[in-house]
């Protein structure tokens, strides 16, 4: 278990010709904060899969405007660190993604609004407790400049975080083939298997069945003196055990290499070894080649077969940036209908509709009633964000399409039984009631509160509602 | 699916003429809105010219006044006519379609890209 640590130094306009323009404005403050993404290994995935090693967000940087006429500066960053906790080992290869957010401060609907300002990508090779390494990247006019590293949590140590520490069991030294953990010298670390017959005084191991050996000593089993040639050309304290110098701190004691990489001794100095994407006389610049996988997304990359001469990623249409990390700007076609707002989600174009329209590009217009036919007769109204059909007797329903019950509000007063008919409904009235709904009782006299009954019916009759 | 199929483009000196065309073709119920994106050496791809899906024209200020944008419904076809081409027109010229495949599902395709070099 560790922590990737990530420092960005600053964010601003890049070297040479058409400087961006500053991000916000005096009409508009904004903030930056930062987003790390982080996928073990250098397999080539796309800007959009999971972040397997873990991501990371900034805290919000401080409110900027825009001084008006200039430049746009170095913009102000978050304090801190971004800190990405891993739970297993180092995987020591990693692809990285950088993104600069921009939170707008100005009078937003509903909350500041955030955009994306720039995206950096790139897979680097790193050792666990190494030095910082330091890293620049451009995405498009911006320049993001930041340093990174990974260190082990406690017990956890070595340069995959793997080996591990325990508290010491005698007060004074370590058991047979263990050392102190550095920078925990109270404790040790644990077992290790090392190779067979390697000195527990004068060996130690960092992997299953090596043998390294303590200065003074040497031999595959660490059990010979380091010969008295050495002592020709002392550079260090005289031995006890031996009455000979042993050597004292070599050019690669400390390991001067960076990123991982391997440190011999020359004659007049050291040399590193640096590993596949990185050079320098310490393996400190990033030289990213095509073996390196650096274009995102299906990007075709060219040139950059050795480390110093650069890679280009020609990307697939609808990708842009230096590793095609980017999409293109689909919005700007204005594919939203009736003043939507257009969002490019990436996978899919989203547009926000308007109150009244709907649909994927807000095409519908939901309180217009042109071209919005009513079935059977009905009649389209407008109005209330939304059309309505008055639907004609019989009918009812969104466009007036389903058949209606007309007994369904039980129409029929007075304990009236209700057919549905036709051309409507016929209300059977119980003695005492008639009308078209059973509404008047009929009078003790035989006499009605209505008009005398047409011809042929007689109260108690079914009244037909026409 | 939808193909997006460009044609046009080529070598030309500056202040000539060339035209572009993308047919669309496929299972397409409407098109919503079509255009042209310019991918210029080290710059990013940008809208050059297109009608919109409320049906308006819209042009990158860049080639107001130069370049004509047409469409042929019938033939769900686009044209970019260019006239008076500077060297800074230069790069590949993508045709772009946001298309209805039917009536409740839209989705935006590519077309493969066409160069475009302006010698001065």
């Known amino acids: 278990a560790g922590v990737f640590e990530l420092q960005i130094h600053s964010f601003g306009p890049g070297p040479g010709p058409g400087a961006p323009r500053s991000p916000c404005s005096a009409r508009l403050p904004c903030r930056l904060f930062f987003r790390v993404c982080l996928k073990p290994g250098l397999s080539e995935e796309a800007a959009e899969s999971p972040c397997a090693l873990g991501a990371a967000l900034s805290a919000r940087g401080p409110v900027y405007t825009e001084q008006p006429g200039a430049p746009a500066p170095d913009l102000p960053l978050p304090d801190g660190l971004l800190q990405v906790p891993f739970r297993d080992a180092w995987p020591g290869t990693f692809s990285f993604i950088i993104e600069t957010w921009r939170e707008e401060l100005g009078d937003q609907i509903g909350g500041p609004a955030w955009s994306l300002l720039a995206r950096v990508a790139g897979r680097r090779r790193l050792a666990a407790g190494g030095p910082w390494a330091r890293d620049i990247q451009r995405a498009g006019a911006w320049e993001l400049r930041f340093s990174y590293r990974a260190r082990c949590e406690p017990p956890a140590v070595g340069t995959a975080c793997t080996r591990l520490c325990r508290p010491r069991s005698a007060p004074s030294r370590c058991g047979p083939g263990l050392r102190p953990c550095a920078p925990l010298e109270d404790e040790c670390e644990a077992p290790l298997v090392c190779r067979a017959g390697c000195s527990p005084e004068h060996g130690f191991c960092e992997q299953p069945g090596e043998c390294r050996c303590l200065e003074g000593w040497t031999g595959p089993l660490c059990t010979v003196p380091v010969s008295t040639s050495s002592c020709l050309s002392p550079r260090g304290p005289s031995s006890a055990t031996t009455g000979c110098l042993v050597p004292g701190p070599g050019p690669c004691d400390g390991n001067p290499c960076a990123n991982g990489g391997s440190c011999s001794e020359t004659p007049r100095s050291f040399e590193c070894t640096c590993p596949r994407g990185f050079y320098g006389l310490r393996c400190e610049v990033s030289g990213v080649t095509c073996a390196d996988g650096p274009c995102f997304n299906g990007g075709l990359c060219v040139g950059g077969a050795d480390p110093d001469s650069a890679y280009i990623c020609h990307c697939p249409p609808g990708f842009q940036g230096s590793n095609c990390e980017k999409r293109v700007d689909r919005c700007s076609l204005q594919p939203c209908r009736n003043g939507g707002l257009c969002l490019d989600l990436g996978h899919a174009l989203r547009c926000r509709c308007r109150a009244g329209f709907a649909g994927p590009r807000c095409e519908h217009d939901l309180d217009d009633c042109a071209g919005r036919a009513c079935a059977n007769g009905g009649t389209c109204v407008e109005g209330g964000g939304a059309h309505r059909c008055s639907c004609a007797l019989g009918f009812g329903g969104r466009d007036c399409r389903e058949r209606a019950d007309p007994c369904a509000a039980r129409p029929c007063a007075h304990g009236g039984r209700c057919y549905a008919h036709f051309s409507g409904l016929v209300c059977a009235c119980a003695p005492g009631y008639m009308g078209a709904r059973c509404e008047f009782p009929v009078h003790p006299d035989g006499a009605s509160a209505l008009p005398a009954a047409p011809p042929g019916l007689r109260p108690g009759d079914p009244q037909r509602y026409l | 699916q939808v193909q997006l199929v460009q044609s046009g483009g080529g070598l030309v000196q500056a202040g000539g003429s060339l035209r572009l065309s993308c047919a669309a073709s496929?299972?397409?119920?409407?098109?919503?809105?079509m255009g042209w994106y310019r991918e210029a050496p080290g710059k990013q791809r940008e809208l050059v010219a297109g009608f919109t899906g409320d049906g308006m024209t819209k042009y990158a200020e860049s080639v107001k006044g130069r370049f004509t944008f047409s469409r042929d419904n019938a033939k769900n076809t686009v044209y970019l006519q260019m006239n008076s081409l500077k060297p800074e027109d230069t790069g590949v010229y993508y045709c772009?379609?946001?298309?209805?495949?039917?009536?409740?599902?839209?989705?935006?395709?590519w077309g493969q890209g066409t160069q475009v070099t302006v010698k001065p």
């Open positions: 772009a379609a946001d298309v209805f495949t039917d009536r409740d599902h839209v989705d935006w395709y």
């Open positions: 496929g299972s397409i119920f409407s098109i919503n809105a």
